[in-house]
Amino acid sequence: DAHKSEVAHRFKDLGEENFKALVLIAFAQYLQQCPFEDHVKLVNEVTEFAKTCVADESAENCDKSLHTLFGDKLCTVATLRETYGEMADCCAKQEPERNECFLQHKDDNPNLPRLVRPEVDVMCTAFHDNEETFLKKYLYEIARRHPYFYAPELLFFAKRYKAAFTECCQAADKAACLLPKLDELRDEGKASSAKQRLKCASLQKFGERAFKAWAVARLSQRFPKAEFAEVSKLVTDLTKVHTECCHGDLLECADDRADLAKYICENQDSISSKLKECCEKPLLEKSHCIAEVENDEMPADLPSLAADFVESKDVCKNYAEAKDVFLGMFLYEYARRHPDYSVVLLLRLAKTYETTLEKCCAAADPHECYAKVFDEFKPLVEEPQNLIKQNCELFEQLGEYKFQNALLVRYTKKVPQVSTPTLVEVSRNLGKVGSKCCKHPEAKRMPCAEDYLSVVLNQLCVLHEKTPVSDRVTKCCTESLVNRRPCFSALEVDETYVPKEFNAETFTFHADICTLSEKERQIKKQTALVELVKHKPKATKEQLKAVMDDFAAFVEKCCKADDKETCFAEEGKKLVAASQAALGL
């Protein structure tokens, strides 16, 4: 399958439009601070070069690898040293070390201004004036802020973004048509980015085996009628796709993802009965649809797992012959029977099974030793079930905002060293599990909740890795991918933490809070709550609630006052004094 020119091969496979979009995404994800115009110039140069290679694959430099071509192009940026500091040292390296170096410098929390949405008329004018530039700008802004965004999926988002403007800029009420669509794309985009970030962390921090185990479990739940061999093939192909995308090989990734979608649709009869509608769609929609497809119905009359994995006298023989294949079969069989379990729970069960076999297959009487292995699963299953039940009850009692606040307090007490913006962002997202999952029936709650929490806790892990401040976070993030959530759940109040000095400035607010959206105002209040807990980690729920109620009333009052700024100044001083008294500061 070797091609004389890799760049010509990908250009022909993907077409010019997708080729240019993917190169722009790749460059923006590597050089996150570079201006848009600089990236467009680089992309145009690469595209022109690719066209010469399509015309003549033997032309000069056309035989070079994509990493070499793209890396050389990135290293021509004049301001590399001033803008990126030590990342410029990557350019002194040879491939593949140079690409690895660029990957290591991807920043999950780049210092970029928040994206402010212009007025609808301004956006529509820009869209009509130059549609191509407008859409490229979208790709660029998302890619640089989300350096691990799944590139072929970003093409799908851009397609929907274009469709929204095409439709709504002609509508009678442009804003009513467009704004809900943009909100939906923004929220879905953030979720998609976070999900992909977990896949990349899984591959990069825990290796291919960890990712494959995750994929076996998830695909077996989704395609329970498919044979193990079929699931294994899909897992191998999916692992290749995600390895490529996480490694910055976006052209190969998009090409291979298209091939995988094609294969799945050509073989849907042996994979799942739920794929028919997906497979009638165009490529980008098709791939997205397959990735989100609902679980197929479980085959009727599946035999008990115990026969092959506990009662059989050949368990140790089968395990010894091909450990990973046997464990893969166990995971496949368990997962297809349990769409009601989270993937991480299934992986914990498989790990327990593996540990038991490792121990028992070396024992005098292996069968006697592993006979009760399924009994060890009971507490592992009950722990997330109970946790979800308790937290959904709390969510239903409090509502989303107050539930988020309860989690803010809980997590700040566990890991008070973590930066306030990170604690706010992560706890707000943890709190969204309530509205996302608690509405589901029992059978769907755990896969929804625990797998979502894995995605959110990974955000905490990647943000913390950039500036590590807490040994407890490092420990929970690095010891075991599947036990991250139980590890964080088990953390108690950090008794070693020295409370932060009280700083009145932290609790000084101004009239600008009144013009913020409800969400932004919540974030301000939640930021204050985290700071309160950092000052007084032993504060009771009741004390914190009293202070937060005072704070809400203070904002409400001053935002209704004639002289808002004076109100904030005078009432603010009293709020600080009242809070200090209430918390005994």
């Epitope: 009333a553 005078e570 009432e571 009293k574 004094a577 209430a582």
Partner: nanobody
Framework: QVQLVESGGGLVHPGGSLKLSCAVS????????MHWVRQAPGKGLEWVSG????????TYADSVKGRFTISRDNAKNSLYLQMNSLRAEDTALYYC????????????????WGQGTLVTVSS
């Protein structure tokens, strides 16, 4: 405009009880701390009790501690003072007073007063 109207005063025997009420209008009641202040015949003003915007923080003058209870009902825009074990020295004109702040911290800042209701404790 801001209005504070007290009621519930009257003549009572020593050891007896009374409940004063204050109905407010013309402002957002839950945006303010509230107080009771009294003036005995021929004497100056004496602060009696204060309550924060939501009733979380309550303070009393030493002279009434354990006998008087301040409360508020934000839904009804009303302030109350339950007076038990009344003594002759509690005889006074009782004023319902708005604080300019939400909170009871430091010196109170009175900005609006009612007309007062008279309490007479006598045998």
């Amino acid at each position: 405009q801001v209005q504070l109207v007290e009621s519930g005063g009257g003549l009572v025997h020593p050891g007896g009880s009374l409940k004063l009420s204050c109905a407010v209008s013309g402002f957002t009641f839950h945006h303010y701390a509230m107080h009771w202040v009294r003036q005995a015949p021929g004497k100056g003003l004496e602060w009696v009790s204060g309550i924060s915007w939501n009733g979380n923080k309550i303070t009393y003058a030493d002279s009434v501690k354990g006998r008087f209870t301040i409360s508020r009902d934000n839904a009804k825009n009303s302030l109350y003072l339950q007076m038990n074990s009344l003594r002759a020295e509690d005889t006074a004109l009782y004023y319902c007073v708005r604080d300019s702040s939400l909170f009871i911290v430091g010196a109170p800042t009175f900005d609006h007063w009612g007309q007062g209701t008279l309490v007479t404790v006598s045998s």
